[in-house]
């Protein structure tokens, strides 16, 4: 099976680690959630970057 972390499944610069039960994201400071999708501070609406144009898988780099 291909490296599951190659798809870059963690948001906002979170680091991906393979785990016996699946994947684990180690979030960058300021983010939380299983995939590091939420800003820690609830008033930080601007913390999320703008979405790129198009919903498509990216290149397989971490």
């Amino acid at each position: 099976r291909a490296d599951p972390c190659a798809a870059r499944p963690c948001a906002h610069g979170g680091r991906c680690y393979a785990h016996f039960s699946g994947l684990v994201c180690a979030c960058a400071p300021g983010y939380m959630g299983a995939r590091c999708e939420f800003p820690v501070h609830p008033d930080g609406a601007s913390a999320l970057p703008a979405a790129p144009p198009g919903l498509r898988p990216g290149d397989p780099q971490r």
Epitope: R8, P9, M32, G33, E37, A45
Partner: antibody, heavy 124, light 113 residues
Framework: QEQLVESGGGLVQPGGSLKLSCKVS????????VSWVRQAPGKGLEWIGY????????YYASWVNGRFTISSHNAQNTLYLQLNSLTAADTATYFC?????????????????WGPGTLVTVSS | DVVMTQTPASVEAAVGGTVTINCQAS??????LSWYQQKPGQPPKLLIY???TLASGVPSRFKGSGSGTQFTLTISDLECADAATYYC???????????????FGGGTEVVVK
Amino acid sequence: QEQLVESGGGLVQPGGSLKLSCKVSGFDFSNYGVSWVRQAPGKGLEWIGYIDPAFGRTYYASWVNGRFTISSHNAQNTLYLQLNSLTAADTATYFCVRVALVVAGVAYYGMDVWGPGTLVTVSS
Amino acid sequence: DVVMTQTPASVEAAVGGTVTINCQASQNIYSYLSWYQQKPGQPPKLLIYRTSTLASGVPSRFKGSGSGTQFTLTISDLECADAATYYCQSYYYSSGSSYGAFAFGGGTEVVVK
């Protein structure tokens, strides 16, 4: 082609149980989750829960209260929704939906591919 | 849980006109807001995700905007094919259980004259 196809719907008596299946093809679970959404006849959309197969996690709407269970068989690319203690209020079309979670490091959380749905009718 | 309040419940407009649909979240959902179009007998179709990004194949007549708790879908140059029910959908952090959850608005029926 990215596709989800539900099956297992039908007529069930109040208090009964049913297990719905969702066959998934054409995409990798690493980037995506699969959600179950239902729609009662003539009503709006209601989110039930979703599974993030790459992380081995399931999440549910608070109203589910343990009556419904989502599971997956990753090797067969099949997902399931177990429905228990059914009442007439659970009569609905149940959709299996792909959720774009985090694609190439960017978070989306949009439901981008929908199955045709399977109708569950709870009636005596 | 987050409650998504969608207004109006129904709106009518002429071909070539413009329709605006509003969606209000009961808490900050950042930019995690999607819009869907559903026609009778069909599953919903994703139009817009992350507040303003058009899904593949969706014409630029559809425009999403907003942030935080207030969001808007604007459909301009209305066509007969735009007659449908439109739903907003949020993804939010559920602090009570520390996980992400989804919620839909009640829907807006668009009638094109």
